[in-house]
């Protein structure tokens, strides 16, 4: 058993039929010595008396909020949560496996630049009685600070009868140098509690590997005289690290017709303009990627040819 | 992704072309190592990230863009003194800091060159003959060092008397290539920045 936060405790259980469970001793947080009784959740049934209560925790029915009272007055609470271990593996029932980029990916994180700010997302099918708490650090043995906000519900997806909820959190490394060469990864730890079930999820990454720039901005077309060609120009996204001559991007320009079958023309360039042929009903799209470290491409920025 | 080969403009900062070739060469070598040594811990997640230049050079600090010198987190100032002449500085008003930066890069290259050559000598003795260092990568390191043209004592290749442990050598190769790729990215960013300024 260990303390998750004040008055909230996690009991780690090997989960198999007829498992012996875990013996837990609860102590009432009071100077009182006599006349103390214990109850569980909303029930008025007295489970025991005295300053301590010893219980055998085997299943979810044994978890919950234990309260010690004296003469109708509440003295203190202890909330017991269960963390299940099945065949030596901690349960992952609360979050959905993304399976991308590999199996057992529950948290996905991205950064728009090298400032030390990043966002992580996860999915669940659970809609109620659900809380998340996020901690992060750079390295684990001598951790350096990363501050995370509160996790918030960021989207909802409905597939047939199933609803999926996406949560996200934003974190910022406390003292990040954009030019630094990372040698210790960022660690992200998410505590998830659904009713009386506790689970934890972790992700470990270097900012450089989760970089995904915002799409190029200010995408414009300028027709060239007496020609089907146009000059496409764009700018670095506002969120990209500066100076741009140090944190350079490379770009992919794509001309795509309305129909899926039409051939895509693609040009790669380090400049912020290119000359392409604009076909009727086609659209021109541009995306960006770090020029020197090949992490993810940005989403496309697009303009119609007409 | 293979970066397109850049043909430098005649007036271009002379080292930019060499640094682009360096990044391309080390990225290709790392990719080859990861494929060839697929049953060894050779991915970024599996290896320990070591920097052989730590406390010996200060490339990141010495080569910091002017705009980032206001960022306190970037000013982990380590005092290191370097020789301040070099042909990449040709026909440019250069600050002491820029000379320090380029000589720090030179020292990095020299250190990695020694390590890679020592390692290659061991790998050539491996009866499996599984992997060797790409001669092109070693040549590109040499070219960039020549372009930087700093006068510095040559460091003798390390020779070791003990039996080579080929498994350990291959793991060390992965560690070295990952670290060198990260340093090559920094070098490329620096050259691009100096070229623009």
């Amino acid at each position: 058993i260990w303390e998750l936060k004040k008055d909230v405790y996690v009991v780690e259980l090997d989960w198999y039929p007829d498992a012996p469970g875990e013996m837990v001793v609860l102590t009432c947080d009071t100077p009182e010595e006599d006349g103390i009784t214990w109850t569980l959740d909303q029930s008025s049934e007295v489970l025991g008396s005295g300053k301590t209560l010893t219980i055998q925790v085997k299943e979810f029915g044994d978890a919950g909020q234990y309260t010690c009272h004296k003469g109708g007055e509440v003295l203190s609470h202890s909330l017991l949560l269960l963390h299940k271990k099945e065949d030596g593996i901690w349960s992952t029932d609360i979050l959905k496996d993304q399976k991308e980029p590999k199996n057992k990916t529950f948290l996905r994180c991205e950064a728009k630049n090298y400032s030390g700010r990043f966002t992580c997302w996860w999915l669940t099918t659970i809609s109620t009685d659900l809380t998340f708490s996020v901690k992060s650090s750079r390295g684990s043995s001598d951790p350096q600070g990363v501050t995370c906000g509160a996790a918030t519900l960021s989207a909802e997806r409905v597939r047939g009868d199933n609803k999926e909820y996406e949560y996200s959190v934003e974190c910022q490394e406390d003292s990040a140098c954009p030019a630094a060469e990372e040698s210790l990864p960022i660690e992200v730890m998410v505590d998830a509690v659904h009713k009386l079930k506790y689970e934890n999820y972790t992700s470990s990454f270097f900012i450089r590997d989760i970089i995904k720039p915002d799409p190029p901005k200010n995408l414009q077309l300028k027709p060239l005289k007496n020609s089907r060609q146009v000059e496409v120009s764009w700018e670095y996204p506002d969120t990209w690290s500066t100076p741009h001559s140090y944190f350079s991007l490379t770009f992919c320009v794509q001309v795509q017709g309305k129909s899926k079958r039409e051939k895509k023309d693609r040009v790669f360039t380090d400049k912020t303009s290119a000359t392409v042929i604009c076909r009727k009903n086609a659209s021109i799209s541009v995306r960006a990627q770090d020029r020197y470290y090949s992490s993810s491409w940005s989403e496309w920025a697009s303009v119609p040819c007409s | 992704r293979n970066l397109p080969v850049a043909t430098p403009d005649p007036g271009m900062f002379p080292c930019l072309h060499h640094s682009q070739n360096l990044l391309r060469a080390v990225s290709n070598m790392l990719q080859k190592a990861r494929q060839t040594l697929e049953f060894y811990p050779c991915t970024s997640e599996e290896i320990d990230h070591e920097d052989i230049t730590k406390d010996k050079t200060s490339t990141v600090e010495a080569c910091l863009p002017l705009e980032l010198t206001k960022n306190e987190s970037c000013l982990n100032s380590r005092e290191t003194s370097f020789i301040t002449n070099g042909s990449c500085l040709a026909s440019r008003k250069t600050s002491f800091m820029m000379a320090l930066c380029l000589s720090s890069i030179y020292e990095d290259l020299k250190m990695y060159q020694v390590e890679f050559k020592t390692m290659n000598a061991k790998l050539l003795m491996d009866p499996k003959r599984q992997i060797f260092l790409d001669q092109n990568m070693l040549a590109v390191i040499d070219e960039l060092m020549q372009a930087l043209n700093f006068n510095s004592e040559t460091v003798p290749q390390k020779s070791s008397l003990e039996e080579p442990d080929f498994y350990k050598t291959k793991i060390k190769l992965c560690i070295l290539l990952h670290a060198f790729r990260i340093r090559a990215v920094t070098i490329d960013r620096v050259m691009s920045y100096l070229n623009a300024s």
């Epitope: 991308e100 999915l123 795509q256 017709g257 899926k260 895509k264 496309w300 | -």
Partner: nanobody
Amino acid sequence: EVQLVESGGGLVQPGGSLRLSCAASGRDFDRSTMAWYRQAPGKQRELVASIPSDIGTKYADSVKGRFFISRVYAKNTNTVYLQMNSLKPEDTAVYYCYAHIDSDYWGQGTQVTVSS
């Protein structure tokens, strides 16, 4: 024929709410990223919110905490909604629905005016 049909725009007072919807049909949009963009008079078109098929929803900083995107996957149609709360005069714009599979598809746009 690919169609993105937006609805739900209109005139609303500051502090009020609107819910935009966009039905995408004519292609299998299940694995696409869908999004809402907006364009105010004389300004560039800007991303308001995007929702990929898997994970990684994004919001413009100016709408975070006020706007909420959701998506319904049905047999032949994908519908993306934008719930807009605590609307401000600066949210006035034409709102466009967008979908990307292997190329870009745009709706015709729906006008949102926030004014007292």
